[in-house]
Amino acid sequence: MAVTACQGLGFVVSLIGIAGIIAATCMDQWSTQDLYNNPVTAVFNYQGLWRSCVRESSGFTECRGYFTLLGLPAMLQAVRALMIVGIVLGAIGLLVSIFALKCIRIGSMEDSAKANMTLTSGIMFIVSGLCAIAGVSVFANMLVTNFWMSTANMYTGMGGMVQTVQTRYTFGAALFVGWVAGGLTLIGGVMMCIACRGLAPEETNYKAVSYHASGHSVAYKPGGFKASTGFGSNTKNKKIYDGGARTEDEVQSYPSKHDYV
């Protein structure tokens, strides 16, 4: 029950996270004009990954796409790539995790297969979240380094005086959406990986024993060895009990003093 809940919650959290990553990638407000020194401005500039926008005092907003690839900085291209990779991985992860959900029955799918799919989707969500966080962080770093760089001239109009104003850009809403969304996707992925451990088939004890008859008075001690799934420690059919019961490897060994009465 706890495993199903963890898996389901992980799926929902990742779903919200990936939706957030998509939203952040599409948003125009990755960088916004810093209004610290000029809170009442007639023009408000902001940029996204795909277009640059201007909101004018009358309420009119104009956005222009970046119709060039070569004219854009490599960092911006890298951010675009990271966000797209994050979305693609997240989308594949969601698709895989739907089939991996314990509450959904698809044919006669083994629990081990569901466990593997859960782990796969979990890893995909983790990488997707990391891509989004990395992309947003790279953009944020680019903003910080360019904070004082971008300048523009503005005429005040009265008497035609020229006033040089620095158009500085600060963090936009999309950055915060991206960070939160990336974090949620990451958390969802971790939850899926945790759920995977619970979904894996548990170790089963079999009372199977191999022994040889060495006389009519064999002191037989029932024992056994574990048939392991690989998750346990007894993976090499080690002898569990001493006595007449032997592991497969010991069948042709020399008789011990305990074999005869």
Epitope: V43, P73, Y155
Partner: nanobody, 123 residues
Framework: QVQLVESGGDLVQAGGSLRLSCAAS????????MGWHRQAPGKQRELVAM???????NYADSVKGRFTLSRENTKNTVHLQMNKLKPEDTAVYYC?????????????????WGQGTHVTVSS
Amino acid sequence: QVQLVESGGDLVQAGGSLRLSCAASGSPFGFVVMGWHRQAPGKQRELVAMLTSSGTTNYADSVKGRFTLSRENTKNTVHLQMNKLKPEDTAVYYCRAVLRSGSDWRAAANEYWGQGTHVTVSS
């Protein structure tokens, strides 16, 4: 440096016509909005007409049907055709433009004002 150069202001009789022009020099990358504002003596500056890059034109209620704002496609130039002028249209007319400063992705748009041209309508 971008500058707005206005022309066409004059003294005109009531009921007459006048054409104001505003040209943005200094080869700006493109306009977001361009238009005209006016300031009558002792009054606040008000919007007369505004043209957006999407082609929408807005007019003040007091000038609707009398004034027409047009743009030259080849240049960042706007013309305000003023017909049936009234004495209350007397004011200093200022050209205002929001222009993009370049094609670079970080290029900001800024607001620019002209120095103003006087329009006097006598009764």
